[in-house]
Structure formats: C-alpha cells, structure tokens
C-alpha cells in the first residue's frame, strides 16, 4: 500500500525556519518575504513504529528529494543527519528505525522524538544561522519545539 | 522459553475496577511490548491496547477512557485496569507478546497466555 | 480502524479434507496478517504471521497466502487434532483488529 504522506513545513517556536545548508545540513533561521520561499519543504509520511495514544510515528523526507532525516551514532554521540536512500524504495510504511520519529503533539506545539534515540528530539539553537541537530534536552537553551505548516501538493 | 501467566480476582462488582497482572519470562519487558485481548464467552477476540518497552502506550478507542496498562519492568510484570466495570466487561483476558522487529512484523503478537476468566456481577 | 471481514463463519469437515478460509481487509494491509488457532479453553497459538510464514514447529500442512486486501489460510489435510476455530488478525495499523472467527467441526 502506498504510504500516507503530506507535504509541510516547519518553524521552530521562536518562528525559525529550516532550510538548506549544504547537500546534507539543515540549518535555522529567521526569514522573511521572498526569502521564505527557501525554507524546505518536508514530505512527512505516516509509518509503522511505537505508536501511542499520543506518539504518531513519521518519516521526514525532503520533498522530491530521496534525502531523509535520519538518527545515527557517530563518536558515541546521538547525530541527526541528511540520509540519500534509493527513490524507487522509499518512502514505505516500513522504514528503518533511524528514519523514524515520534510525532509529538503538546499545546499545540510538535516535537520529534527519535525513535532510535528515546528523549533525543530534532533540536535548534536559540542563535542564528546554526544547524539543526539532534538533541538530549528538552526545556534548556536548545528549542525542540516546532509548528508545522501545510503545503498544498 | 517464553512464557506469560496473567492473574487477578475472577469476580469484579459492577462499577468497580477490574484488575489483573500478567507476569512474564523469557524476554525482557524492556525489549517487547505486551497486549492485552479479551474474549466475552462464546464470542470472538478484541484488543484492547498495548504497553511498548519505552512504557509509552496505545489503547483502543472504545475503551481509552477507562483502561490503563502499566507494568514494573523489575518484576517482570505488566498491570491492566478497567474501571467502571459492566456485565459487558466479562471475559476471559489475555496478554500476549509483541512480536516487535522493526520493519518486518512491528505489530504482530507471538505468543499469548492462557487466560483469565473475569466475571462482573453483584 | 481496519475491519476484518473473515469467512465462512463455521464449517463441517472431514478428516483429511482439504479446508480454505478467507480474511477481508477494509484496507490494503500488504501482508501484514496473522492467522492464530485456538481450542477449546486454550489461548490462541500463532500458525501464521506476515501472511505466509510458518513460526518454528508448526506443521507444513497449514499454509497462508495473500496481500492487499484478500487472504487465504489454508489446511492441505485436515488432522483430527486440527478442529478448532481459527482467527485472522490485521497487524497493519493500530488499533489491532481481528476477524469473527471460523469455527471448523467434525462433519
């Protein structure tokens, strides 16, 4: 079965936007006018994981683009990273665990926790201009909480 | 070997919380989730909800306001408690193992144990 | 939720008959289907998972095909020890749903 998917966008909650920074970086930061046509647009598919009444498991791909958001280990150290995966294959319900998120809906902000990586979450520094990381704190400096945006297909 | 013992009082009164634990061995309650199903007499299965290893937990929808899973990962023991109990709720109740590999069978159940019978009535 | 639409409701057979009983997904599921055998006062046993693979132990005579939507279990040579009743379930999506049964009895 083809796996749900719908395209969006996301802020961070001080209004950063994601966009690229290289072919395998995010990074946040506050645009506006014509400039917000930079931001990514991500294509957030609905797959199998952990689910629970308040946990929804998604994949995050860049949209017409066969770059997903993955969690890794590198140095012993939890790492968001760009993957490049084959297009002909993804996206599916069944993605790899790396690749999956748990979709977390508090007062109307989002989280994203990994599933690879339980209490790490997509992360932005409060400064400008810096990557999007991964993340092992929540309620610190670092911002792990995100609106999202629709996009029309 | 992988096995799952559920127990519990097999009378409940109306209005009260039905409560039964499931003990489990051979797997770690860190690694697999368990579910719990029930069968009311002559009837067919219903599931109920999970408890995953991260403790999060899934319940079905017509039962989300009065059940919760739970479990004492120490003890090897995973809880069910339904409250406001009915004649309705009389069934046998199982709990039964995740299957739980990723990106093959994540949702499947493998083995079960072999029941509880819980009766509700004054 | 996915309903599970599973037939016949019972059937008569004989010793060494050939049986089939079919699951209908109300949504393509791919293979993600369960078939489980229960007895009488007993917990369900897992015959079948991903709708065609057999768990370790369990006899060659029982056997599971499908994907999509419309599945099929079937015993190549009905034992006696094989009457029972027998239930789909859909490990697709949460919540986990099963079909009605299929109550298989001696003719």
């Known amino acids: 079965a083809p796996v749900r998917s719908l395209n969006c966008t996301l802020r961070d909650s001080q209004q950063k936007s994601l966009v690229m920074s290289g072919p395998y970086e995010l990074k946040a930061l506050h645009l506006q006018g014509q400039d917000m046509e930079q931001q990514v647009v991500f294509s957030m598919s609905f797959v199998q994981g952990e689910e629970s009444n308040d946990k929804i498991p998604v994949a995050l791909g860049l949209k017409e683009k066969n770059l997903y958001l993955s969690c890794v280990l590198k140095d012993d150290k939890p790492t968001l990273q760009l993957e490049s995966v084959d297009p002909k294959n993804y996206p599916k319900k069944k993605m790899e665990k790396r690749f999956v998120f748990n979709k977390i809906e508090i007062n109307n902000k989002l989280e994203f926790e990994s599933a690879q990586f339980p209490n790490w979450y997509i992360s932005t520094s409060q400064a400008e201009n810096m990557p999007v990381f991964l993340g092992g704190t929540k309620g610190g400096q670092d911002i792990t909480d995100f609106t999202m945006q629709f996009v029309s297909s | 070997e992988v096995q799952l013992q559920e127990s519990g009082p097999g009378l409940v009164k109306p209005s009260e919380t039905l409560s039964l634990t499931c003990t489990v061995s051979g797997f770690s309650l860190r690694d697999y989730g368990v579910s719990w199903i029930r069968q009311p007499p002559g009837k067919g299965l219903e599931w109920l909800g999970l408890i995953w290893g991260s403790g999060d937990t899934y319940y079905n929808s017509p039962l989300k306001s009065r059940l919760t899973i739970s479990k004492d990962t120490s003890k090897s023991q995973v809880s069910l408690k339904l409250s406001s109990v009915t004649a309705a709720d009389t069934a046998v109740y199982y709990c039964a193992k995740q299957t739980n590999i990723w990106g093959y069978d994540l949702y499947g159940m493998d083995y079960w144990g072999q029941g509880t019978l819980v009766t509700v009535s004054s | 939720d996915i309903q599970m639409t599973q037939s016949p409701s019972s059937l008569s057979a004989s010793v060494g008959d050939r049986v089939t009983i079919t699951c209908q997904a109300s949504q393509d599921i791919d293979m993600d289907l369960n078939w489980y055998q229960q007895k009488p006062g007993k917990a369900p046993k897992l015959l079948i998972s991903?709708?065609?693979t057999l768990p370790p132990g369990v006899p060659s005579r029982f056997s599971g095909s499908g994907s999509g939507t419309d599945f099929t279990f079937t015993i190549s040579s009905l034992q006696p020890e094989d009457f029972a009743t027998y239930y789909c379930?859909?490990?697709?999506?949460?919540?986990?749903?099963f079909g009605q049964g299929t109550k298989l009895e001696i003719k």
């Open positions: 379930l859909q490990s697709d999506w949460l919540p986990l749903t």
């Open positions: 991903q709708a065609n």
